[in-house]
Each structure stands twice: as structure tokens, then as C-alpha cells.
Interface confidence: low
């Protein structure tokens, strides 16, 4: 077969070829940051020709044009300077009202180097209608100038731009615009990551609730759904495995739908996710009505053996099938609970549509929708019950009109997307889902994007202050109680001085919080085995401290997951029935257990916590220490087993006021608190006014560093005789 | 933590069927987490994977082994056991149990070394 | 069936860097996995999904996947990690395992 030639060269970019210079290869060109290429593509014709897709003349020299945004076309009650055709990259547009006038949005909006807007469309309303004034997007047309009940707004784009969001909205009863903001756009634009995972995300959280069936209350969280023990969701996952799509942008859509899955499963909800690639036709790799959908083990088995050349004999884009796919496994579960039932009908179904190309065989989408719709009764009650997600990959050949009309229509909400590569692709299925944001008490979630702040990846420590010394930390467990150590407190019991520091989004410094009561518990004594040459003994170093108020989960305050409770249980995903055993069996697995601390300047540090024969060997280094045990014959003396044990090898070491602060280890996208550091051999910040600085210690240090925290599966009684009322346990 | 022990003849006889059982403590064998596996290492060779089993027992074998090779859970005893008929000398090898979590090998048994006598 | 071709020794002088590679047709649309086996011990899980890292496997450990050939370096060679490594795919719902490398540490 004729090659097609290389000749294709773009000034100012690069390009890749998806299948070599072979007929059916896709040329993709791509330019810097705030340059477009033009055309986009190139595909090898059988003639050994290239085709410019959508061209109608001849073969032009490929270049990188300048991106630009669109100008406003129109702007009610009001004025916007400068007044330009279109904005280059890094221009500004800025927004005045008249007299009379309130400007909501943003007053000033600068160009970004992938040609949208940031910031909010500016309106300048007076407040008079039912809804409030919908806006005119830049680059946008607007019909229609009454705000009433029932009434009907209409937009168009101007020029070339690409219309997406709803181009008809209807002012509701609520006084809330139906479907979503119009955007106009330029054809080659895409979304950033960064702009998609939390639009995504939002959308997402708010059908999946991740609410925690413990609760005994629900507050509401947007159009957030309760998906409870009853409520299922269904998941398909539709991969775009036609012939414009690389083998290598494959392995990512793969990646990145393994990430969503995994995601998925950590919510607290019951989830079936179904798996179909798609070229020319469909192939089904996991169906909702197979059990081991809902096993996700199971469901990333089968994305992980999806394989790129099953569909090598028919390479086209053929949407339609993919989606009547997912209707007819629709159709099937209907027929198999009954239409008539609640287990059918308080399914909620999420289609996420993964492709980097247009359809361009098998007929509409849009009809595979539509039946879909049908199918599952969606009207304005149960608008809920559907979220389509179509989220284009690659600049080349998506096509904006497809994709926004397959995408659901929700206010404050967007379902449809373009980024520019799987890469970014993958950036957004690792961020998007942040349950973080909710409001209920949820245990055991940290925000685990690259940008959050320390705070946010551990909401749940605290920080204890006494009126003199030396500080502790702790960690939240509900909304009113914090575990810390118990030596915290042994200079006497008045704690009406002492302070508890808690995260909060408001301030950096977080919001403090007064004691109402102390519970230390009555084993511990540090003078307990003095008489036995054994200065100081830190048996039973716990307590619980019961704030005076109760905290407002946030971002930045949240408890942590404590094992053998019914909330830690639905946290691992456990069966009902599971036991406290069978926890420790799960969190403490390995001879050496990853694990986590937080350092007094608020990072994360790294232990392993040593189990079985290697604790032995972790704790026999006590038998060293001379100064402080001078006649120890029994390490055992000392570190009974109520103690974990870590400080070898690359492990950091706390330093001395990071103690009543966490152990923890992470399960599931989730956070659970298995110790809490209690006392060491070797203080790393000895001598350091500075909190970022720790001296490890020498390779030479006689005793090496050793750390011990309290093992809360050793503490389980004295936990649930104070917390009984608090959480939930589960039987030993 | 999960710990994996083979168990089984250290020989058996050419043609007959080796029989392993491979009992796994430190977490339920049915957790949908998991998933279970046998691979062999033939004297001074490599690794050769044998087969795996899932929860649900959805099973995989190497093709290799043209149907020889039967993979079971017994979730009750908490183990999981591989059947190989018709053996022949070149099945000797040492014979690791492994448990995987996503697609990957992370807990092995210590192995077990099968002889196939004639 | 799918082949994954490995050296069959690589030597590396203490303190120095070791690569070993395994080789497989378009093996970059493949997620890599990397095992360590001491001599008569179990194999243990050194690198997954090409270049992630098992909690516990230090640093020095890393892993890269390219075209037709996947990467296990190890930085810094210590003799502890004289053993034999094999590279491991999934292919078409089978596991395949490379040939294995022994590396000597000089």
C-alpha cells in the first residue's frame, strides 16, 4: 500500500502520527501555548494522499495561528472597553453598569492561552424579574428580554463560534433558569484540567451524595442525591476506541477510567459500573446485570484486558451503537426488576462518554439519548436519575455541537467537555472526585490534589496548646471529639487555659476551640515502674478531649476514620457483619505497614509500622537505651503490646510536640487512624527553633531511633466505654 | 497481614495429578479486593504463571497448560488449591500461591517444591 | 502469544546504575510490572503500572515504558539487590513474564 508523504511539516509546532505514514493514519498537529494549528489535522488517505478533515481546497501549508477570544456582541445596561473584534491572550475586557444596575460576575476578564474567558459572565440587572437576569455570554446573541415565570430565552453564537451549554432557557417556578449557561467558543478551544476536574467534580458529587448512611441527620448539599443503602447507581464507562485514537491515548482512557472506578467505589454508596469500548460497533467488556459489576476488583479486571485491537477490523466512530448499548443493557435490567418497581426505579444512571472524535457512522447519537431518556421516565421530577458526561479528548476533530447536545443540560453544571489531550485526561479523572467538599461528617477524607494545602489533606489533626508548654496534637473523630495522648496532660488538670487550634477554610491559623471536658484515661501513669529502673513508662497514653462546640466540617476540619466502627467499615467498603478483627486483619496486613504522621510544620511524613516477628525485632533496640532504662531485663517491660512500633530504616521520626497526633494509613481513597504517637527514642527537631527543620539522626546513634504509638486496636474497651454514644462499633 | 503457606505432596508420580492447597490467613480469602494465583519456577528457570481465580471464581489459565489445570476457592478453610493432571518431569518446579490486588503479585507463599518422579 | 524478551544477566558496579529492559512488540500501550526474586525467597513486587512504586520499595527503584522496550533502573546499587528481576504483563486476560535478568553487583 502507498505511504502518504512526509512533507507535513508545521512552522512553529509538532506533530504525531497515530499509525506511522501508512494509509488511516491521523496527523495531529500541535503548537505552543496560545498558538492553534491550522488545520488540526491530516488523515492518510488508501490513495496515499493526505485529507485535511472538513477542507474544501487543496492541501495548505500547516501553521500556528495566535489564539483569540470572542468579543462581546452584546452587553445590557451597560459598557465594556475596550471595544476590539476579538482579544489576544492575556487582553482584558472590562465591565461597567448604568445607574440603576448591580453588576454580578466579573467586572474584568482576561483572555487564557486555550481562547475562553476566565472568571463569570458580568450582568448588570436591576433585580426586577422572577429569575434573575440569565446574561448574555460574550460572543453571544440573546433573544427573548422577559425574566416572568415561564418565560423563554434564546441564544445563537455569532460568526464561527461554537455554541455549548443550553441554547433555550425557561425562567422556573423556583426562580431558577432551566438547563445550563450558554458559552460561545472558538472551534479550536478547549477546556484546562484544572477548570474541568471541579466542574466535573461538582456535578459528580452532587448525584453520588456520598452521603454516609450512619448519619442520623442529612443536610442538603446543592442537588446533591441520598443515595442510601436502598438508592444504586449504575456507571457506564464508554471508551472511544476507534482509529483516530492511539494505542498509547487508549492505555490512558483505560487509566483514567480505572482511576474513576476506583474513585467510585470509595463512595459510601452501591454502585454497578458498566464497561463498553466502541469503533464501528460496541463491545460490552462488563454489564450492569453481571454481579461482578459491582466488585471493583472485578470491573478494573476487565478495563485492564480491554484491548485496543479488538477492534481493528471496523475503525470508524460509531456513537450511536455505543449508547443504544447502554440502552438495551437498560432495557434488559427493566425487564428483569420490572418497570413497575423501586429497585428499578431508584436507579440513577451516569454515562461518561470518553472519545476524541466525532460519530461518523450509525446515525445520531442524539436518538440513542432520546430513548435512553424514555427509557428512564426523565422529566423536570426526575431530572436526577440521568447525568450524560460527554467529554471530548484532543483538539483535532471533536465536535463541540455533538458532544454538548449528548452532555445533560443542569443549572450551575456542565457535562460536556473538551481537553486537549489524554493527559489531561488523566489530570481530571485524578482530582475530580473531592468529596472533601461536603458538609456532612463523613470520616476519612483528605483532599489528595497536588494544590491543596497541608490542612486540607488532614483535616481531621489539631493542635493542642497549653498556656505554657510544649504543645500536642490530635485528631478529630466526630464533630466534638478529639484523641490525643494522655502525657499531655500530666501537669495537673486544669484545662480551662488549654485550647484545641482546628482547621478552618476562613483563616490559615484555624479557629480554636475551648475543652469542656478532659477523659485521660486512669492507666496511665509515668511513674508507674520507676521503682523497677524504669524512669518513665507510657502504657495506656491515651485520652479524649470533648470540645465545647461542636466544628463545621470543611475542607479543613473533618474527622478521621476510627477502625471497628460502622463508619470506618463503610469507609473499606466491608460486608455488614464485618468485625473488629477482620479490621486489623485489613489496615495492619503486612510485616510492614505504610503509614503516615503529621509533622509540626503540618506535612505528611512517612512510617512503616512493624507487625509480627518484625515488631519484635523493631522494639528489642529499647534494651540500648540506658539513660532512661538503666536495669531493663524485659524490653516487654516497656513496650508492651498496646505499643506499635516504626523508626527504622528511612522512616521519620516525630519530634516531641507532634505527640497525641495520628497514626494513620490510607485504604480506598480514605483515611484511617490505627495509633497515635506516643514517645521515641531520638527527638529530630531537639535544639531547632525552627518547626520545617529535622536532623535525622546519625547512622551511628546508639540506640537507633525507635518511635512507639498506641495501638487503638489494643484500646478498643476504654474506646467504646466513652465513645459508645459518639460512633458506631462494631463487635470485636 | 496476609500470609499465604502452600501445601502438598513434594512428589508425585508421572501422569498422576498434583494436587496443591494454598491456605491463606491475615484477611478472608472472599474479599472482592483479591484475587488468587498459582505460578511455578522450574529448577534454575523462570517464572510461569499458571492461572488465576477471582471472588466471584471466575477463573484464567495459561494456555499453555492446554486444560490441565484446575484452579478452586474454598472459602470456608479460608484456601484456594490448584489441580494439574497428566504431569510429566518437566512440571517439576517450585510452586507459589500468590495473591494479587488490581493486577499485580503483591503477597506470595514461600513456594513449594513438587517433584514429578517416573 | 505475546513475548517478553529480557538480558539474561546485567552486572552493575556498587554505587552505579543498573537498567534492564524488556522487550515487547508496541509494549508502551502495556502497563509494566517489575519483580524482585532473591535467591531461594518468593518474588516481591519492586514497580507496578510501568513506574509506581510499592510502598516500602525504596526510591532507588524506578521504572519507564517507551515504544517496545519497558525499563527497570536501580540507582545506586547496593548488594542487596543482586537477585534475579522479571518484568510481567497482562495480555488478552493472561499474565506473561519475561525471561528474568540476574543482576550481579560488582
Known amino acids: 500500500a502507498p505511504s502518504c508523504p512526509q512533507n507535513v511539516n508545521i512552522s512553529g509546532g509538532t506533530f504525531t502520527l497515530s499509525h506511522g505514514w501508512a494509509p488511516g493514519s491521523l496527523l495531529t498537529y500541535s503548537c505552543p501555548q496560545g498558538l492553534y494549528p491550522s488545520p488540526a489535522s491530516r488523515l492518510c488517505k488508501s490513495s496515499g494522499q493526505w485529507q485535511t478533515p472538513g477542507a474544501t481546497r487543496s492541501l495548505s501549508k500547516a501553521v500556528c495561528k495566535p489564539v483569540r477570544c470572542p468579543a462581546p456582541v452584546s452587553f445590557e445596561n451597560g459598557i465594556y472597553t475596550p471595544r476590539l473584534g476579538s482579544y489576544p491572550v492575556g487582553g482584558n475586557v472590562s465591565f461597567e453598569c448604568e445607574d440603576g444596575f448591580i453588576l454580578r460576575g466579573s467586572p474584568v476578564r482576561q483572555c487564557r492561552p486555550n481562547g475562553m474567558w476566565d472568571g463569570e459572565t458580568a450582568v448588570c440587572d436591576n433585580g426586577a424579574g422572577h429569575c434573575p437576569n440569565p446574561g448574555i455570554s460574550l460572543g453571544a446573541v440573546r433573544t427573548g428580554f422577559r425574566f416572568g415565570h415561564g418565560d423563554k430565552v434564546r441564544y445563537r453564537c455569532s460568526s464561527n463560534l461554537v455554541l455549548t451549554g443550553s441554547s433555550e432557557r425557561e425562567c422556573q417556578g423556583n426562580g431558577v433558569w432551566s438547563g445550563t449557561e450558554p458559552i460561545c467558543r472558538q472551534p479550536y478551544s478547549y477546556d484546562f484540567p484544572e477548570d474541568v476536574a471541579p466542574a466535573l467534580g461538582t456535578s459528580f458529587s452532587h448525584m453520588l451524595g456520598a452521603t454516609n448512611p450512619t448519619q442520623k441527620t442529612k443536610e442538603s448539599l446543592g442537588r446533591k442525591i441520598q443515595i442510601q443503602r436502598s438508592g444504586h447507581l449504575n456507571l457506564y464507562l464508554l471508551l472511544d476506541c476507534s482509529q483516530s485514537v492511539s494505542e498509547n491515548d487508549f492505555l490512558i482512557f483505560k487509566e483514567s477510567a480505572s482511576l474513576m472506578v476506583d474513585r467510585i467505589f470509595s463512595f459510601e454508596i452501591n454502585v454497578s459500573v458498566a464497561i463498553i469500548t466502541f469503533a464501528s460497533e460496541p463491545k460490552v467488556l462488563m454489564s450492569v446485570l453481571n454481579d461482578n459489576s459491582r466488585d471493583m476488583t472485578e470491573v478494573i479486571s476487565s478495563l485492564e484486558n480491554a484491548n485496543y485491537k479488538d477492534h481493528e477490523n471496523g475503525t470508524g466512530t460509531n456513537t450511536y451503537a455505543a449508547l443504544n448499548s447502554v440502552y438495551l443493557m437498560m432495557n434488559n435490567q427493566m425487564r428483569l426488576l420490572g418497570m413497575e418497581t423501586m429497585a428499578w426505579q431508584e436507579i440513577r444512571h451516569a454515562i461518561i462518554l470518553l472519545t476524541d472524535g466525532k460519530s461518523n457512522m450509525g446515525g445520531s447519537p442524539k436518538t440513542a439519548v432520546d430513548h435512553i431518556r424514555e427509557i428512564l421516565n426523565i422529566n423536570q421530577k426526575r431530572n436526577d436519575y440521568l447525568d450524560i458526561y460527554a467529554i471530548g479528548v484532543g483538539k483535532l476533530d471533536v465536535d463541540w455541537r455533538e458532544l454538548n447536545e449528548l452532555g445533560s443540560k443542569k443549572d450551575g453544571e456542565r457535562h460536556a467537555f473538551i481537553l486537549q489531550d489524554t493527559k489531561a485526561l488523566h489530570q481530571v479523572f485524578e482530582h475530580m472526585l473531592d468529596v472533601s467538599k461536603l458538609t456532612d461528617t463523613i470520616c476519612g477524607v483528605g483532599n489528595m490534589s497536588a494544590n491543596a494545602s497541608d490542612q486540607e489533606r488532614t483535616p481531621w489533626h489539631v493542635t493542642i496548646k497549653p498556656k505554657s508548654q510544649e504543645t500536642c496534637r490530635g485528631a478529630l473523630i466526630s464533630d466534638q471529639w478529639v484523641l490525643t495522648a494522655a502525657h499531655c496532660f500530666r501537669d495537673g488538670n486544669d484545662h480551662s487555659l488549654w485550647r484545641v487550634n482546628v482547621g478552618d477554610p476562613k483563616s490559615q491559623w484555624g479557629k480554636e476551640f475551648l475543652i469542656e471536658k478532659a477523659v485521660i484515661s486512669p492507666g496511665f501513669d509515668v511513674f508507674a515502674k520507676k521503682n523497677q529502673g524504669i524512669l518513665e513508662f507510657y502504657g495506656d497514653d491515651i485520652a479524649l478531649l470533648k470540645l465545647a462546640q461542636k466544628v463545621k466540617m470543611s475542607t479543613h476540619a473533618r474527622p478521621i476514620c476510627l477502625p471497628c466502627t460502622m463508619e470506618a467499615n463503610l469507609a473499606l467498603r466491608r460486608p455488614q457483619g464485618s468485625t473488629c478483627r477482620d479490621h486489623e486483619n485489613e489496615l495492619l496486613n503486612k510485616q510492614s505497614v505504610p503509614a503516615h504522621f503529621v509533622a509540626l510544620n503540618g506535612s505528611k511524613l512517612n512510617i512503616n509500622l512493624k507487625m509480627g516477628v518484625e515488631w519484635t525485632s523493631c522494639a528489642e533496640v529499647v534494651s540500648q537505651e540506658k539513660t532512661m532504662f538503666p536495669n531493663l531485663t524485659d524490653v516487654r517491660e516497656v513496650v508492651t503490646d498496646q505499643f506499635l512500633c516504626s523508626g527504622t530504616q528511612e522512616d521519620e521520626s516525630p519530634c516531641k510536640g507532634e505527640s497525641g497526633g495520628a497514626v494513620f494509613l490510607e485504604r480506598r481513597f480514605r483515611f484511617f487512624q490505627v495509633g497515635l504517637v506516643s514517645w521515641g527514642l531520638y527527638n529530630p527537631c531537639l535544639g531547632s527553633a525552627d518547626k520545617n527543620s529535622r536532623k535525622r539522626a546519625p547512622r551511628s546513634k546508639v540506640p537507633p531511633p525507635r518511635d512507639f504509638h498506641i495501638n487503638l486496636f489494643r484500646m478498643q474497651p476504654w474506646l467504646r466505654q466513652h465513645l459508645g454514644d459518639v460512633l458506631n462499633f462494631l463487635p470485636l | 497481614q496476609l500470609q499465604l503457606q502452600e501445601s502438598g505432596p513434594g512428589l508425585v508420580k508421572s501422569s498422576e495429578t498434583l494436587s496443591l492447597t494454598c491456605t491463606v490467613s491475615?484477611?478472608?480469602?472472599?474479599?472482592?479486593?483479591?484475587?488468587w494465583g498459582w505460578i511455578r519456577q522450574p529448577p534454575g528457570k523462570g517464572l510461569e504463571w499458571i492461572g488465576t481465580?477471582?471472588?466471584?471464581?471466575?477463573?484464567y489459565y495459561n494456555p499453555s497448560l492446554k486444560s490441565r489445570g484446575t484452579i478452586s476457592v474454598g472459602t470456608s478453610k479460608n484456601q484456594f488449591s490448584l489441580k494439574l493432571s497428566s504431569v510429566t518431569a518437566a512440571d517439576t518446579a517450585v510452586f507459589y500461591c500468590?495473591?494479587?490486588?488490581?493486577?499485580?503479585?503483591?503477597?506470595w507463599g514461600q513456594g513449594t517444591l513438587v517433584t514429578v518422579s517416573s | 502469544s505475546y513475548d517478553l524478551s529480557q538480558p539474561l544477566s546485567v552486572s552493575v558496579a556498587l554505587g552505579q546504575t543498573a537498567r534492564i529492559t524488556c522487550g515487547g512488540n508496541?509494549?508502551?500501550?502495556?502497563?509494566v510490572h517489575w519483580y524482585q526474586q532473591r535467591p531461594g525467597q518468593a518474588p516481591v513486587l519492586v514497580i507496578y503500572?510501568?513506574?509506581n512504586r510499592p510502598s516500602g520499595i525504596p526510591e532507588r527503584f524506578s521504572g519507564s515504558n517507551s515504544g517496545n522496550t519497558a525499563t527497570l533502573t536501580i540507582s545506586r546499587g547496593q548488594g542487596g539487590d543482586e537477585a534475579d528481576y522479571y518484568c510481567?504483563?497482562?495480555?488478552?486476560?493472561?499474565?506473561?513474564f519475561g525471561g528474568g535478568t540476574k543482576l550481579t553487583v560488582l
Open positions: 500468590a495473591g494479587g490486588v488490581g493486577v499485580t503479585w503483591d503477597y
Open positions: 491475615g484477611g478472608p480469602i472472599s474479599s472482592s479486593s483479591y484475587y
Open positions: 481465580i477471582y471472588y466471584s471464581g471466575r477463573t
Open positions: 510481567q504483563v497482562w495480555d488478552s486476560s493472561t499474565v506473561i
Open positions: 508496541d509494549i508502551e500501550s502495556k502497563n
Open positions: 503500572r510501568n513506574s
